[in-house]
Every structure is written in structure tokens, then in C-alpha cells.
């Protein structure tokens, strides 16, 4: 609601104001009535039977102060002209309201020409004879406004031209938009402007411990002519460590926190944090618990995971399948990843070194989310140690690591990959390959072949190369062929048994 600042209140003055009447004593005059043992004062005039009335009542000089537009509230009664037989010709039922601005009080020097008419004041209800005699007078309330005012003060004047009027209340006030707290912003008491369409823009100030949020608009409101605040723009939010309680920002209670300026309340400190003091913006982690840079302050503090729970390394020739189970303690996080590292040791010398460059992983060995990986291209007769480390978002904040190791000895080369290169009615040309790292340890390759279905006899050919042509074979016959590498330490893993068929004599020409 608009705040009214009263400049003049006749009814409240108890007849003490001593307004000027002109002509003196013949027109307007002060009267007193007693109601409920209290004196009620009014200025009245009722010279309805005489024509040519021009009676003036002028207020005392009113200091304008900061007012720009004044509001004039009048409470008055007007008697019905029909109450006065024969007086209808000169009787009126209205009076006129005037004002004059001045920089000084003219005292008793009253000059009508200085006054400007505001309006003719007409009653909504007139008091008829029966009501008047029954003491049921009809009280009218009218309000007018004047502005903008520019001089130090002003007078109001009431001109009677032959009515029967009693003026019970004259209240002159101006309007202010009252001091206001809204959106955690304080808006000062502001004088309402004088022009109806205009709105005075007023900047607000954030209350203690409140701020304009980043990218937000500064709080502003508009003070209308009627003293009402309109069109709020922007707002303030309680800063980190404070929450909104009614129209203020109150420090978070111990054990609670708020990490940013927002509308949200303080939150209870999450798990694995120390009790916070009053006004905390975050809750410190317990010893051994951490927060990753990207973790919200509302998230519990966490710790690195324990080692992978169970790790197996299953050798398959020159391959190893590593399998493990997740850590028993995830550290309170779900962002666990695994890293696999490899170390190889030469049995003869006992010398060891990293083997990342010489082995091949089924998927990149760092940042694994699955719990298995296959490592191939392993060298035969070598000892391998595989380390699987579990990490999460806070592992980088500690120096210790959580890992488990598994060792495996590769006693055989990887089985050769065999291909049929060519064939005739009596021969088969076969080639094979093994991973380059293993080739240096191979002494010879042994090719074993026999007719399919004949389990009693087989033939063996040895060669240092990667191919062989098997001759003196029967036409149109299926042979079972296997290739095995021979090393200084013994036999390597055999290839799988392949079935190759010689050509039939009819098709030999093709």
C-alpha cells in the first residue's frame, strides 16, 4: 500500500487551525458539535436565502516539503435546496475548490485572483430535511489531486456561492512508496511522482549477505503516482553460506552448508565430512576422504578404491586372458576405471622390463571399464607379470595405489596361423605365420600331415622357412595338416588341424 504523508488535517487539529474566512463572520464559520463527549469541528455556511453569495474559506499556509503531487480529501455534507422553501432560486448544492502556490505565507492578506480552481465539488448524496432533523446527515467524501507543485507552500480555498455546506474534514497529503523489502532487496521510501503515466525507477540494495546472482539483473522497482510499487525487476539471492529466512539471509547452521548464491536452502553436510561451523560454504572432508574437482559440494566425500578383488591370468599359448572382479570398497564412487601394465622377465638372466611396446591388448589398457582384457603377442618362455590398478575420481589426490598382480610363464609359442597357398592333384602348398616377436626363438617348423581317416601313419617335414610344398600325394584326397614351431626349449603350440584336399585328375587341367 502507498504511504500517505499528511500535510494538513483539519479534523485532527481540533479547531485550532484558525482558517481565514472572507467576508469575516458572514459566510463560512467554524462550528463545534459534541459527539460521544468529543468535540467535532466543522466549517459551515448556509446563506441559501440570500442571492449573490461569494464566501471564501482559506486554509493556513501549508509547507510543501518534498511533495510533488498533493491529494485533497474532503468530507462534507450538503443540504437539499428543497429544504428551503422559496430559496430554490439562489440556493446551490455545490462549492468550489481552489489552490494557490506561494513561497511565503501571506497571512491575512487574501487575494482571490491568486487562486486557481481545482474543481467544482458536488455531493453524491444530499441531506434532505427529514434526514437533517433526524440527525442522519449524509457524509460525502471527495478526493482531488494537484501537481506538480513547485513553490515552497500552498493554500487551499473553498468558495461558497450559496449552498448549505458543512466541511467536516480536509486532509491534504502526498504519497510515498513505502520502504520495502522484496526479493531480498531493500527499496527506500520514495516520493511518488507527479505525472500519472510516469513511473519512477528505484534501485534496490541487496540485504546483508545477499548478492545479485552472476548474470542476473540488479533489483529495481517502479514507484507509481499512487504510492504503489510496481514492476519488480531482478532480485538478490542469499550468498554462499546463507539461506533465506523471511526477508533476510541467515547463516547456515552448524552442520549445514550452502556453496553458492542460490534460492536453495542450506543443505546438511554430506557423509564423510567434518561438522561445519556456522555460515559454511562447504563441508571439509574427513581424513582419508576427498572431493574431486568436479564433485558437487553436496556429494559425500569419497576415497580411492581398494585393489581389484580377484585377478586371474589364464595363458593360451602366446596369449593371456586377464580377468578380475571389482574392488570390495569402491570408495563411495561409481567412476572406477582400471589400468593394466605388463612386465616381462627373461628366465635365463632374471632381467625384467616393461613390455607395453611388444604386446598387444584387446582394448586400450588404460581407463578400462570392463573387468577383463586379452594380452597377445607374448614371447614364449618368458615370465610376465601383469598389474591391474583400480582408480576413481579421487585417486589422483593420493600417492598410494590400489592394485593387484598376476604372473604367468609363456612356455610355448603361439600356434602358427596356417593358409593353403596352392594345390594340384598330387601336391599341397602350405604357408604359416607367427607373431614377429616370437620368430627369433623358433629353430624350425615341423609340418605333420596324413590322409584323413588314416590314423595309423603320418608324415613329418621340417623346414626353417614359412612354407612348404607337400608332394607325392594322392589325387582327390583330403589331408589333415598341422604346423608346430620348434624352439631350443622344445615344441611350441601346434596350429589347429586343417583339412586340405588335392585336386581330382579331371580338374587338373583347370
Amino acid at each position: 500500500q502507498g504511504k500517505e504523508v499528511v500535510l494538513l488535517d483539519f479534523a485532527a487539529a481540533g479547531g485550532e487551525l484558525g482558517w481565514l474566512t472572507h467576508p469575516y463572520g458572514k459566510g463560512w464559520d467554524l462550528m463545534q458539535n459534541i459527539m460521544n463527549d468529543m468535540p467535532i469541528y466543522m466549517y459551515s455556511v448556509c446563506n441559501v436565502m440570500s442571492g449573490d453569495q461569494d464566501n471564501w474559506l482559506r486554509t493556513n499556509w501549508v509547507y510543501r516539503g518534498e511533495a510533488e503531487r498533493i491529494f485533497i480529501e474532503l468530507k462534507f455534507t450538503v443540504r437539499d435546496c428543497n429544504s428551503f422553501p422559496g430559496g430554490a432560486s439562489s440556493c446551490k448544492e455545490t462549492f468550489n475548490l481552489y489552490y494557490a502556490e506561494s513561497d511565503l505565507d501571506y497571512g491575512t492578506n487574501f487575494q482571490k485572483r491568486l487562486f486557481t480552481k481545482i474543481d467544482t465539488i458536488a455531493p453524491d448524496e444530499i441531506t434532505v430535511s427529514s434526514d437533517f432533523e433526524a440527525r442522519h446527515v449524509k457524509l460525502n467524501v471527495e478526493e482531488r489531486s494537484v501537481g506538480p507543485l513547485t513553490r515552497k507552500g500552498f493554500y487551499l480555498a473553498f468558495q461558497d456561492i450559496g449552498a448549505c455546506v458543512a466541511l467536516l474534514s480536509v486532509r491534504v497529503y502526498y504519497k510515498k512508496c513505502p520502504e520495502l523489502l522484496q526479493g531480498l532487496a531493500h527499496f527506500p521510501e520514495t516520493i511518488a511522482g507527479s505525472d500519472a503515466p510516469s513511473l519512477a525507477t528505484v534501485a534496490g540494495t541487496c540485504v546483508d549477505h545477499a548478492v545479485v546472482p552472476p548474470g542476473g539483473e540488479e533489483p529495481r522497482m517502479h514507484c507509481a503516482v499512487d504510492g504503489e510499487w510496481l514492476v519488480p525487476i531482478g532480485q538478490c539471492l542469499c550468498q554462499a553460506g546463507y539461506e533465506k529466512v523471511e526477508d533476510a539471509c541467515q547463516a547456515c547452521s552448524p552442520g549445514f552448508f550452502k556453496f553458492e548464491a542460490s534460492e536453495s536452502p542450506c543443505l546438511e553436510c554430506p557423509e564423510h565430512t567434518l561438522p561445519s561451523p556456522e555460515g559454511a560454504t562447504s563441508c571439509e572432508c574427513e581424513e582419508g576422504f576427498f572431493r574431486a574437482p568436479q564433485d558437487p559440494a553436496s556429494m559425500p566425500c569419497t576415497r580411492p578404491p581398494s585393489a581389484p578383488h580377484y585377478l586371474t591370468a589364464v595363458g593360451m599359448g602366446a596369449k593371456v586372458e586377464l580377468r578380475w572382479t571389482p574392488p570390495q570398497d569402491s570408495g563411495g564412487r561409481e567412476d572406477i576405471v582400471y589400468s593394466v601394465t605388463c612386465e616381462q622377465c627373461w628366465p635365463e638372466s632374471g632381467e625384467c622390463g616393461p613390455c607395453e611396446a611388444s604386446v598387444r591388448y584387446s582394448e586400450p589398457p588404460h581407463g578400462l571399464t570392463r573387468t577383463s582384457v586379452t594380452v597377445s603377442d607374448l614371447e614364449p618362455h618368458m615370465n610376465y607379470t601383469f598389474t591391474v590398478e583400480a582408480r576413481n575420481g579421487v585417486s589422483g589426490l593420493v600417492t598410494s595405489r590400489s592394485f593387484r598382480t598376476a604372473s604367468v610363464s609363456i612356455n610355448q609359442t603361439e600356434p602358427p596361423k596356417v593358409r593353403l597357398e596352392g594345390r594340384s592333384t598330387t601336391s599341397l602348398s602350405v604357408s604359416w605365420s607367427i607373431p614377429p616377436p616370437q620368430q627369433s626363438r623358433v629353430w624350425k617348423y615341423e609340418v605333420t600331415y596324413r590322409k584323413k581317416g588314416d590314423s595309423n601313419s603320418y608324415n613329418v617335414r621340417r623346414t626353417e622357412g614359412f612354407s612348404v610344398t607337400l608332394d607325392d600325394l594322392a589325387p582327390d584326397t583330403t589331408y589333415l595338416v598341422q604346423v608346430q614351431a620348434l624352439t631350443q626349449e622344445g615344441q611350441g603350440a601346434g596350429s589347429k588341424v586343417h583339412e586340405f584336399q588335392t585336386l581330382s585328375p579331371e580338374g587338373s587341367g583347370n
Epitope: D29, L30, M31, N33, I34, Y41, M49, S83
Partner: antibody
Framework: QVQLVQSGGGLVQPGGSLRLSCAAS????????MHWVRQAPGKLLEWVTV????????YYADSVKGRFTISRDNSKNTLYLQMNSLRAEDTAVYYC?????????????WGQGTLVTVSS | SSELTQPPSVSVAPGQTVTITCQGD??????ASWYQQKPGTAPKLLIY???NRPSGVPDRFSGSSSGTSASLTITGAQAEDEADYYC????????????FGLGTKLTVLG
Amino acid sequence: QVQLVQSGGGLVQPGGSLRLSCAASGFTFSSYAMHWVRQAPGKLLEWVTVISPDGHNTYYADSVKGRFTISRDNSKNTLYLQMNSLRAEDTAVYYCARASVGATGPFDIWGQGTLVTVSS
Amino acid sequence: SSELTQPPSVSVAPGQTVTITCQGDSLRSYYASWYQQKPGTAPKLLIYGENNRPSGVPDRFSGSSSGTSASLTITGAQAEDEADYYCNSRDSSGTHLTVFGLGTKLTVLG
């Protein structure tokens, strides 16, 4: 207590002059309009004149207009009535009276009265 | 006219009620005031406005008005009420500022 004390009456020849005084006490004299009312022997009350609280405004009954002058000295809390060109019909008891509100009364405080006799 | 007319005299037995009237055009516009005057003393205000009594005036005195008439009523008249009574009103004709009635002599019998 609140009172008005009058002085200055007496016998005067027709055409003569007389000045009546009315000393106020017990109230803020400068806040009230003051009147003179007279009463011929055995007759009704007759309003004579009024002066505004600040002394700037006066009004007279037609019967005394131009002959009588009302004045006041607020610093002395005193009201005066200067009567010139007195006539036999001006013979009366003269009362000063306070208008309790406004210019026209009612008259809530009265002086004790002073007799003015105009006779040759 | 600006005259206020009153009956010259009225009498009442002690303890009885008596009404003194006042007639005049001004009374349509303005309330009457009533004054009591005992021989050799100044008038005393009894009633003003709608029906207001100054402090010290007994409540047996009351006033009323209707149209061009105003009335002073004494309910339960007492011997000490024997006096002259004057009505008074602002003058609505503009001829005078204020006018007094012709006065009424109240006699309390016995």
C-alpha cells in the same frame, strides 16, 4: 479561572464618547473572536460588533456602524469598544463575550456588564 | 427577515416539563443557541449546536430543532430556573452577523 472583567462605563452626554475595556484571563485570548452585546434597560439582548482573533477583521450592526470601533490588544489580553457620537438609544448595559468557536459563537464566556448612560 | 420570535412568558409548576420555542427563517440554516439570564447578571450559555451542553449545565436542559423552529426544554423545572431565556442564531439573511430572540420570561409557580 476563565473570566472577562469589564470597565469604563458611565454617564455621557449625547454626541459624547466613551471607551469600554474588557480584560481577559484564564484562556488564550488571541485564539478567540470577541463580541460586544448590549441590553437596553428591560429589553432584549442586541448584538453590537465582533473582532477576529488577530484583530484584522471586524463587523458591526447597522445601528452602530461608523460610530463605534472595536479593537483588541492581544499582548495585554484586552478588548476595547470606542463609542463616539453617542445617542440616547445607545443607553444600555454593554457585555463583552467570547465566541467559543469561529466568529459567531456561541458566546460561552461573558463579562459582568457595564452600564453606559447617554443623557443630557 | 432576521428576527427570532419567542413567547414573552411561560410558566411551569416545579418538577414539570416546560418548552420554550424560538421561530425564525435563520433556524432552517443554523442551529440556535440558548442563554439564561437572571436579573442583574450576564447571560449564561445553556445549549448550542445540535443539542450540546457546556460543562456545568444541568442535564434537565435540552434543545431540539425542526424547520424554522428551535426549542428549549426543561424537564423537571426547579425554582432556580426562573429567569429570562434568549435564543440566538447566525443570521442567514446577511443583514446581521448574529441575532437574538425577543426573550421569554419563565416563571416557576409556587
